[in-house]
Amino acid sequence: EITRTTLQSDQEEIDYDDTISVEMKKEDFDIYDEDENQSPRSFQKKTRHYFIAAVERLWDYGMSSSPHVLRNRAQSGSVPQFKKVVFQEFTDGSFTQPLYRGELNEHLGLLGPYIRAEVEDNIMVTFRNQASRPYSFYSSLISYEEDQRQGAEPRKNFVKPNETKTYFWKVQHHMAPTKDEFDCKAWAYFSDVDLEKDVHSGLIGPLLVCHTNTLNPAHGRQVTVQEFALFFTIFDETKSWYFTENMERNCRAPCNIQMEDPTFKENYRFHAINGYIMDTLPGLVMAQDQRIRWYLLSMGSNENIHSIHFSGHVFTVRKKEEYKMALYNLYPGVFETVEMLPSKAGIWRVECLIGEHLHAGMSTLFLVYSNKCQTPLGMASGHIRDFQITASGQYGQWAPKLARLHYSGSINAWSTKEPFSWIKVDLLAPMIIHGIKTQGARQKFSSLYISQFIIMYSLDGKKWQTYRGNSTGTLMVFFGNVDSSGIKHNIFNPPIIARYIRLHPTHYSIRSTLRMELMGCDLNSCSMPLGMESKAISDAQITASSYFTNMFATWSPSKARLHLQGRSNAWRPQVNNPKEWLQVDFQKTMKVTGVTTQGVKSLLTSMYVKEFLISSSQDGHQWTLFFQNGKVKVFQGNQDSFTPVVNSLDPPLLTRYLRIHPQSWVHQIALRMEVLGCEAQDLY
């Protein structure tokens, strides 16, 4: 029933291993409440084997993605790149296949991969030096037996280029958190040929030691907690092994730089978090009210004392008891573990509050999303327009623009018979994408659908990432449809943050054929329906300037609910003029980010509002019209009686009361609506 294709994208070839990772359905995997009790067999201690290489690569400290950088740095306008050396994880001892990090580890940036183990476990690290000079693998936890032998020579602490060395040690109790501390404790591993130069060159990574029975056997991590390691340090490129080479790259002859010039020195020092400056560290994405553990690391001289602050949030430290804190002082060589329950959705900042560091860019953003904010992004409704949907090709008239959930007709989907195909949606702005609903289509009497697919995504349309999510493989293979009409809802956990999303069929029936909807939200998790359609907003909360009634029907304000059915299923005013209004009282201040409007059809007559104004009030007495760019905004409403039209409010309104003022209409003023937004949050 299934035809199989290998993946090839339009912009690059993606290598991935053929192991299909089982889709994480709610019943299989739940990051919030997975039972971590393991069978008695799991008490047998294991050896955890990591394949890690020192690999040289170019690094720009996130400067190419930051709009602020060149303002602060005396550069020629081009972003400088620095050769660095990093710890890179590989799939096996052949060191040919690097391990793709995926969303959960994207935040590590320049850091090496997590090495995790429980007390009494053995850790085995096979280290290969793929760099051009000697490096080592070292952690203060490693006990070198030869050091204990009487009269032994000092250990040979370097591995030459293209050499491989295996390190093996047992995790002792003194390395682990005490019973009064959090489940896992952070250490670091690094290279110590020349500790200072090696770290400034980029060789450092997090090593986590956990209580017994903490790590999930399948995932090798604690699945009930989301973990983030943040390494605060000043990377000084003048102390890197590659300083001379980087100078030549970034300052081509004739180069007039004076080494002792303070401006030059500052331009080669990067106040970074995981090797990123100025809010550019990616991957700090977490769910509201989900337990988050931060491992805070610092290395270097005494200038690397940092005062860590998470805006809008407090965190806890645990030393016998738990203490709530808003600020943590981090000292060089100290690795601290703190936990947080992010209570407020939105985009927040983690930063070092010490002036010099903060000014130089030692801050980054973290995104807290609400799992409640999962609405259709507009494939079915048409809010996502035809031009936003493109594909590698199409079969006949089965065009990408038809790939809309529930679309009907004899040709009613995207379809292609080509292998290595893809379909792409441009959301026009970065969004949180929580999931995808897919459907096949019928041609004649046959069933065409995609049974397995992978997802790729991008913020800029150039650099693409393959979605890995919670998969234990190198990427997530999603199971799609089994017929032409059923809807399969696949959830992205963690969600995808992207402007562009691309679906690549890997297995299909007859031809790759798709109708779909994307489920998601804006980056602030603030475009949820506030309750008109669901009736969370009660009838009493909806009022109007007047309403039309006759012996057959009453078109009262409480009927102004999106998709309402019935004989009288909308609000209509008593008379049609621009002074009429419909009002919603949210009963508390809400953040309103959009309105969805819909007309109605009555006795074969289509009625709808073509243009409207919006006003808001905090007290129900004083009203302010919504302005944009210095003038009253006239919103473009409906063009028929049935299709919902979404209008965004930018900037959002913080209001208790909202009014819609119809300004032009077809036949009669008639309105069904939904308000989009979220609860207004106190900032502190």
Epitope: T3, E418, K444, S446, S447, D483
Partner: antibody
Framework: EVQLVESGGGVVQPGRSLRLSCVDS????????MHWVRQAPGAGLEWVAV????????YYADSVKGRFAISRDNAKNTLYLQMNSLTIEDTAVYYC?????????????WGQGTLVTVSS | DIQMTQSPSSLSASVGDTVTIACRAS??????LAWYQQKPGKAPKLLIY???RLQSGVPSRFSGSGSFTDFTLTINSLQPDDSATYYC?????????FGGGTKVDIK
Amino acid sequence: EVQLVESGGGVVQPGRSLRLSCVDSGLTFSSYGMHWVRQAPGAGLEWVAVISYDGNDKYYADSVKGRFAISRDNAKNTLYLQMNSLTIEDTAVYYCAKDLIESNIAEAFWGQGTLVTVSS
Amino acid sequence: DIQMTQSPSSLSASVGDTVTIACRASRDIRNDLAWYQQKPGKAPKLLIYATSRLQSGVPSRFSGSGSFTDFTLTINSLQPDDSATYYCLQDSDYPLTFGGGTKVDIK
């Protein structure tokens, strides 16, 4: 190449019944709409019936409506034609055929046929 | 029902000739037309579907064209192996209907 193989044909008296089968040795049977087409000796082709991929939709030619029943068993990759109240005019070679849907793999769309002779 | 009228009912041509067979539908069938080749004692073989799409494995000397109600099968550079009866089929609406057939002989 994927093969469709019909069976169940033979000589039968008018008014009697016969059941034809068509087995698909390929992997895509459960996705395709399936047809029966017949050809009387020395005559042209005549479409008989169609069934959708899931068995929910069926259509028949007027000449067989009420007498013939098309069905399928996707678990067995098999298409059936139950023929009742046979008449001499039903004498023909019966072919099973797949919906004409283009894919990127070569499909055998027709079987080789099975002969049904209705004779007293 | 949609009637399919095929012409001519038979023709004779020499090897290397170009042969054209016409098929007319009693109403618009968009491009839902297929052409079959049948040799004596054999099952029909699909040549062309969706008016002009060549089935894989079919020589490129066969081509189809047309739209709405008028359709054509063209055989360029006729070969001895092309001696057969050719049928058109509309699969735009039920019941599906075939043309009466065109018998092609090689002189």
